[in-house]
Interface confidence: low
Amino acid sequence: SAGAGSHCQKTSLRVNFEDIGWDSWIIAPKEYEAYECKGGCFFPLADDVTPTKHAIVQTLVHLKFPTKVGKACCVPTKLSPISVLYKDDMGVPTLKYHYEGMSVAECGCR
Amino acid sequence: SAGAGSHCQKTSLRVNFEDIGWDSWIIAPKEYEAYECKGGCFFPLADDVTPTKHAIVQTLVHLKFPTKVGKACCVPTKLSPISVLYKDDMGVPTLKYHYEGMSVAECGCR
């Protein structure tokens, strides 16, 4: 798995809803693949981490003043939905096909 | 300035183009306010860091398994342009009013 020494990339993160206390309202699935963005944003920033101009600037400033300015951060840049069966406000089981923003589609340096 | 112990926020970051080697093609300004996003994404994530669902989930998983899963990261979520006078490919000084993505407008937890 990607650690701090490796470049920014998408890694597996299985999330169990019971672990985060969401099993009280999410009926299914019991767990899902959320993914996590892990790794460093090292100079030079590669195209596959889709750096913004600000991220490029910050990376260059970090090279010059590493104790003063941090590196850019490896974060989700695109998210995808999952399907969930949840209890609505009335406790009625409701299926949401696209519960947005729950799983990482792409990581990048920001 | 905001450190790791403080909450995610926008802090000042003055960038001198000479420091990053961009003075070879950017004529003016000599420096600009890029800002930097600094601070931690601590539970509970406040509305002002506009967390995605994934960031909320990751924060909760981090609470449960802090050594396995990292916190969400404080990054620019909205960028703004600056105006620059630069040398084009022919070396001709050219004014670009909106050189996009150079300065942080907002920070958030992702």
């Epitope: 597996s12 299985r14 299914a28 699935p29 693949e33 399907s83 069966l85 409701t94 299926l95 096909y97 | -």
Partner: antibody, heavy 119, light 107 residues
């Protein structure tokens, strides 16, 4: 133990109709998604339809508008009403249980029932 | 719809061999990939669910790995009863789709 038993297969002419049944036992039927999967002679598996524990239904494009999946939770029975049958619908039809209430792995399967569409 | 592509479509192996079958999804299916074994005239049997979880009662020589778009089923030491056809299937979303199958034959 979990058991699924299909019935209703047989020989039918093109354009005809057939209704398959799947009797389930050994588990709380209403809490699981149930699917129909078919296999043409000498071919691979093709998913046909699903009814979620919520009552939502989905179909493969190849059967949409012709087949209807339904369930009777009081009778622990799954159905597949097949209309406007075509020669390419000839297959062994399996009833399978999803491992939970929405789409998931198919953890238990019936023995299958053969549907032959021929004139 | 999500397309599932298995490779190889068939393979010949001997008892004791290590066998690997791959499955590729046309788009990200996270870890929602399942593997089935089918013997002639029989119903399919679930081996692995959610990419890497061994179904109860399945021998530990079967294992699965992968996430996203690329997945692998491995049989660490092929046994006589393992000669069969293997299918992958995605359960990320409807319509559920199967791979075309991999037939494991005796060499």
């Amino acid at each position: 133990q979990v058991q699924l038993l299909e019935s209703g297969g047989g020989l039918v002419q093109p354009g005809g109709s057939l209704r398959l049944s799947c009797a389930a036992s050994g588990f709380t039927f209403s809490s699981y998604a149930m699917s129909w999967v078919r296999q043409a002679p000498g071919k691979g598996l093709e998913w046909v339809s699903i009814t979620l524990g919520t009552g939502h239904t989905h179909y493969a494009d190849s059967v949409k508008g012709r087949f209807t999946i339904s369930r009777d939770n009081s009778k622990n029975t799954l159905y597949l009403q097949m209309n406007s049958l075509r020669a390419e619908d000839t297959a062994v039809y399996y009833c399978a249980r999803g491992s939970y209430i929405i789409w998931s792995a198919l953890d238990y399967w019936g023995q299958g029932t053969l549907v032959t569409v021929s004139s | 719809d999500i397309q599932m592509t298995q490779s190889p479509s068939s393979l010949s192996a001997s008892v004791g061999d290590r066998v690997t079958i791959t499955c590729r999804a046309s788009q990200d299916i996270r870890s929602y990939l399942n593997w089935y074994q089918q013997k002639p005239g029989k119903a399919p049997k679930l081996l692995i669910y959610d990419a890497s979880n061994l179904q109860s009662g399945v021998p530990s020589r079967f294992s699965g790995s992968g996430s996203g778009t690329d997945f692998t089923l491995t049989i660490s030491s092929l046994q006589p009863e393992d000669f069969a056809t293997y299918y992958c299937q995605q359960s990320d979303t409807s319509p559920l789709t199967f791979g075309q199958g991999t037939k494991v034959e005796i060499k």
